[in-house]
Interface confidence: medium
């Protein structure tokens, strides 16, 4: 039975030129984490792997850093990264937990970033 | 408290093997990984691998691969460090220790077993 | 793999002074860099992760810095219990090395 969830940072927005971290956290549950997926919609941005560590996508070097943590950063933002984004938790035992994080960009100075948290 | 107890001091010849034990208390056993580091008299520290604490499945360095082997007795919140065919340069203090995230960087150590090998 | 390279090997400072030791990765890791802290004849310490976090009770004279491949551990004001050796660790991808260490001796 799968007794986890994953906290996220929610809903954030950024300034268009600025960064922000993308962070989850999985708690409730003793499974262990073997792999972590993060996707904007249905483009895979990076991969965190239990033996193998992170791989980032060749059309996000650039613009994207893993980090801290199990998190990510996402750098040079523009307009255009508005969306979702989910950060993909593979678990043994219990399977696949998804949690969803909704970015804004906007142009001017008065966004407001989310709450941070590091994952411990 | 979070503790990680060793098992005691090992003297051992060549060719023989010896299984180190490691028992953690104050946690969930199986919701961190559990890795484990040697030191070498005088020398700094190395890191051997770790064990998935749920799935059992282990993940050795390089120089690890062969005569070692990470095993596990999640009942008694366990972790085992075996060395087959002992060599002289096996001699060393063997740390075990709590994984953050995957075995990778280690909040909670046991005090260490020190295993000499000579004949 | 990665390797990951401490200097100085050794030094020699006074309670009270300040103390930099400093970690270079053979390539980016980004922050995924621990600091430990091993007094002789016992079990390393975490003090530091994800290069800048500090651990649970350790004390803020401790501080971290740096990212890609350059790092350092900064001790301020050195107290007495300070000295022993001091290993930085990457966590970026396995193997998950240990730089050689660094001993801070008393002066």
């Known amino acids: 039975m799968m007794t986890g969830t994953i906290e996220t940072t929610g809903n954030i927005s950024a300034e268009k030129g600025g960064s922000i971290i993308l962070q989850c956290h999985l708690s409730s549950t003793t499974a262990q984490v073997t792999q972590v997926n993060w996707e904007q919609q249905d483009q895979l941005l990076a991969i965190c792997n239990a033996d193998l560590g992170w791989h980032i996508s060749p059309s996000f070097k650039d613009r994207v850093a893993p980090g801290p943590g199990l998190g990510l950063t996402l750098q040079s933002l523009t307009v255009n990264d508005t969306g979702e984004y989910f950060c993909i938790y593979h678990t043994y035992p219990d399977g696949t937990y998804t949690g969803r994080i909704f970015l804004e960009v906007l142009e001017s100075s008065v966004a407001e970033h989310g709450a941070r948290f590091q994952i411990p | 408290q979070i503790q990680l107890v060793q098992s005691g001091p090992e003297l051992k010849k060549p060719g023989e093997t010896v299984k180190i034990s490691c028992k953690a208390s104050g946690y969930t056993f199986t919701a961190y990984g559990m890795g484990w580091v040697k030191q070498a008299p005088g020398k700094g520290l190395k890191w051997m691998g770790w064990?998935?604490?749920?799935?059992?499945?282990?993940t050795y360095a390089d120089d690890f691969k062969g005569r070692f082997a990470f095993s596990l007795e999640s009942s008694a919140s366990t972790a085992y460090l075996q060395i087959n065919n002992l060599k002289n340069e096996d001699t060393a203090t063997y740390f075990c220790a709590r994984g953050i995230y995957f075995g990778n960087y280690f909040d909670y150590w046991g005090q260490g077993t020190t295993l000499t090998v000579s004949s | 793999d990665i390797q990951m390279t401490q200097s100085p090997a050794s030094l020699s400072a006074s309670v009270g002074e300040t103390v930099t030791i400093t970690c270079r990765a053979s390539?980016?890791?980004?922050?995924?860099l621990a600091w430990y802290q091993q007094k002789q004849g016992k079990s390393p310490q975490l003090l530091v992760y994800n290069a800048n976090t500090l651990a649970e009770g350790v004390p803020s004279r401790f501080s971290g810095s740096g990212s890609g491949t350059q790092f350092s551990l900064k001790i301020n004001s050195l107290q007495p219990e300070d000295f022993g050796s001091y290993y930085c660790q990457h966590h970026y991808g396995s193997p998950y090395t240990f730089g050689g260490g660094t001993t801070l001796e008393i002066k």
């Open positions: 390539e980016i890791i980004y922050t995924f």
């Open positions: 064990i998935n604490t749920y799935s059992g499945v282990p």
